[in-house]
């Protein structure tokens, strides 16, 4: 009996036309939501004038439906048993699942000012930028609507730069009508233990953002894993959101709508400094902000963001070193709310429920030549927002899963 089940599973998890896996893989049957909490700065003037701690108050959730679009340009390659695709991006605001509207205002760091002062270290250039910042009446902080902050706005300061620069700024700009990829993944036809594992991303096996093994594209995209998952496994996956591969380890058995699943979590060790976890040495890209690679819990992804000083962390700086959160007041990290987990059905390797949590931060540094940053006495990794992307298998699908997979085994 078990062999027959194994044979059936192996057949059905292959990523090709006609299998259960393929149908759900092309277009997820699960409703996926992305909730945002924005960090509203309460004391912008005090920070700018006196280099005070930044007082933030999170406001949210503001919820969007995401991942509702089918994969595009799905192309099988029989020669190397891979399938390539683009993952289109789309977000639809869900007012009924939100605390306000997309027109709600927030006081946040001025993204353009922080980024320009970081990208252009040249003092002559900073003096030119300072003039443009002053002319445009820009400051260290700005008031922006949710829609502007997430999806983009025309920045008044950048609009004055007399050179070809992108004048539209937004944390996720551009998003709608764009796609992530091309991904090329193994379809599992020749070797089921490789199914869904990424072969190449954007035509390459490496990212070109990191040194050594940190630059590798490992595992799947976390939507599924090769079947027959063991609790002892370390599940590798690649997340383009954080510009790196990461891993999850088994935490507990969970019953999800009558389906036994394994809960895998991202461990704190994955965010540790190289002092604690030597494997992470290549995620430390500079010595000053990282305090000689002793800081932990924040990832400098500037190389992946055209030099903009974007730092990724867990929400509320969960698992981050005290020096990172010290200049920020109003954060309350807790594991239950702020960690990332994947609930994986072990026989098929399908992720039936997940919560992906991350925080977007921007580095702002003192600048002698830029007036609005002149009074800063220290560097700040400023939290802008955190997000919770979740998906849970629907009741109908769960019933189907129970009857066709887990029910047959039990």
């Amino acid at each position: 009996g078990d062999l027959l089940i194994q044979k059936t599973i192996k057949k059905q998890v292959v990523l090709e036309e006609g299998t259960i896996a393929f149908k759900n893989w092309v277009k997820t049957g699960t409703e996926v939501y992305r909730q945002f909490w924005i960090f509203d700065v309460q004391n912008p003037q005090e920070v700018m004038m006196n280099s005070s701690n930044i007082q933030v108050k999170q406001r949210g959730p503001y919820t969007y439906r995401v991942r509702f679009l089918a994969k595009e340009n799905v192309t099988q390659d029989a020669e190397d048993n891979t399938v390539s695709f683009l993952q289109p991006n789309g977000a639809i605001f869900e007012p009924s699942l939100s605390v306000g509207t997309e027109a709600d205002n927030f006081t946040v760091l001025n993204l353009a000012v922080a980024a320009a002062s970081h990208i252009y270290q040249n003092q002559f250039v900073q003096m030119i930028l300072n003039s443009l910042i002053n002319k445009s009446k820009s400051s260290m902080f700005q008031v922006r609507t949710l829609r502007e902050l997430l999806w983009g706005y025309r920045d008044p300061f950048l609009s004055l730069v007399p050179y070809p620069v992108t004048t539209t700024v937004g944390l996720f700009y551009p998003y709608n009508n764009t796609a992530d990829g091309v991904y090329k993944v193994f379809n599992g036809k020749d070797n089921i233990s490789k199914v869904a594992i990424i072969d190449t991303y954007k035509g390459k096996r490496n990212l070109s953002y990191w040194e050594s093994h940190c630059d590798m594209i490992n595992g799947t995209d976390a939507a599924s894993f090769p079947p027959f998952v063991e609790k002892s496994q370390v599940l590798q996956f690649f997340s383009s959101d954080i510009c790196r591969s990461i891993y999850a380890v088994f935490e507990s058995d969970v019953n999800l709508k009558g389906i036994p699943v394994y809960r895998f979590v991202l461990p704190s060790k994955a965010f540790a400094s190289p002092v604690e976890n030597p494997d992470n040495y290549c995620f430390c890209t500079e010595k000053i902000i990282s305090k000689n690679c002793t800081s932990y819990g924040v990832l400098d992804i500037s190389k992946c963001k055209e030099g903009r000083p974007v730092y990724i962390s867990l929400p509320h700086f969960l698992y981050a070193s005290p020096d990172v959160s010290e200049p920020i007041d109003g954060l309350n990290p807790n594991e239950e709310e702020h960690r990332t987990y994947l609930d994986i059905e072990p026989i098929t390797g399908f992720t039936l429920q997940f919560a992906k949590r991350l925080q977007v931060n921007l580095l702002v540094k003192p600048s002698e030549k830029i007036q609005v940053l002149k009074n800063l006495k220290r560097n700040y990794i400023v939290p802008i927002l955190w997000l919770n992307e979740t998906g849970t298998i629907g009741d109908e699908k769960a019933n189907m899963f129970r009857s066709q997979v887990t029910g047959k085994i039990n």
Partner: antibody
Framework: AVTLDESGGGLQTPGRALSLVCKAS????????MFWVRQAPGKGLEWVAG????????LYGAAVKGRATISRDNGQSTVRLQLNNLRAEDTGTYYC???????????WGHGTEVIVSS | ALTQPSSVSANPGETVKITCSGG???YGWYQQKSPGSAPVTVI????KRPSDIPSRFSGSASGSTATFTITGVQAEDEAVYYC???????????FGAGTTLTVL
């Protein structure tokens, strides 16, 4: 030693264009912002134009804005000043200068004289 | 523009101070011994001195005012001294009108 050699000066006709070239040596040219400064006969120094180390950012003095273009070739270690629609008041000695990093000059060329006259 | 005195005079061996104000940033001081001869940088970035410039030349800055000092002035120091810097109101690099130093 740091040397900056200007060329391209001489007698010019009003309304015409002028191209001055500064050839740099003795330092890593691509690491420095470069400026042009001029001095009219019997007058003080006047800042004309500046360009950052990789040529992305340029800035011009009020008297030449809209008529001047500063450019650089880091491979050749040269900086060029193109001045269009020449006027009599553009007459003077034009100096190439190296920025020490904070709009503060630490080296000068010997200068090239420009006379705009009909 | 930057403001500096039009002239100062001193006896050999005396200390001369020239001030410059109105700039937003680092100042430089430039010596020109005769009109048409190339300027020579004596101080850049407020207080830095090129290696070939004698130690009697020094500079300092506080706020938007820079001070250039010659301690023990010599006859060969007779020249026009220009200060240069950044003018925030004008948004560009500027020079002062020059200070003529006469050594009596």
């Amino acid at each position: 030693a740091v040397t900056l050699d200007e060329s391209g000066g001489g007698l010019q006709t009003p309304g015409r264009a002028l191209s001055l070239v500064c050839k740099a040596s003795g330092f890593t040219f691509s690491s420095y912002n470069m400026f042009w400064v001029r001095q009219a006969p019997g007058k003080g120094l006047e800042w004309v134009a500046g360009i950052d180390d990789d040529g992305s950012f340029t800035l011009y003095g009020a008297a030449v804005k809209g008529r001047a273009t500063i450019s650089r070739d880091n491979g050749q270690s040269t900086v060029r000043l193109q001045l269009n629609n020449l006027r009599a008041e553009d007459t003077g000695t034009y100096y190439c200068a190296r920025d020490s990093g904070a709009v503060s000059i630490d080296a000068w060329g010997h200068g090239t004289e420009v006379i705009v006259s009909s | 523009a930057l403001t500096q005195p039009s002239s100062v005079s001193a006896n050999p061996g005396e200390t001369v101070k020239i001030t410059c104000s109105g700039g937003d940033s680092d100042y430089g001081w430039y010596q020109q011994k005769s009109p048409g001869s190339a300027p020579v940088t004596v101080i850049y970035q407020n207080d830095k001195r090129p290696s070939d410039i004698p130690s009697r030349f020094s500079g300092s800055a506080s706020g938007s005012t820079a001070t250039f000092t010659i301690t023990g002035v010599q006859a060969e120091d007779e020249a026009v001294y220009y200060c240069g810097g950044w003018d925030g109101s004008y948004d560009g690099a500027v020079f002062g009108a020059g200070t003529t130093l006469t050594v009596l």
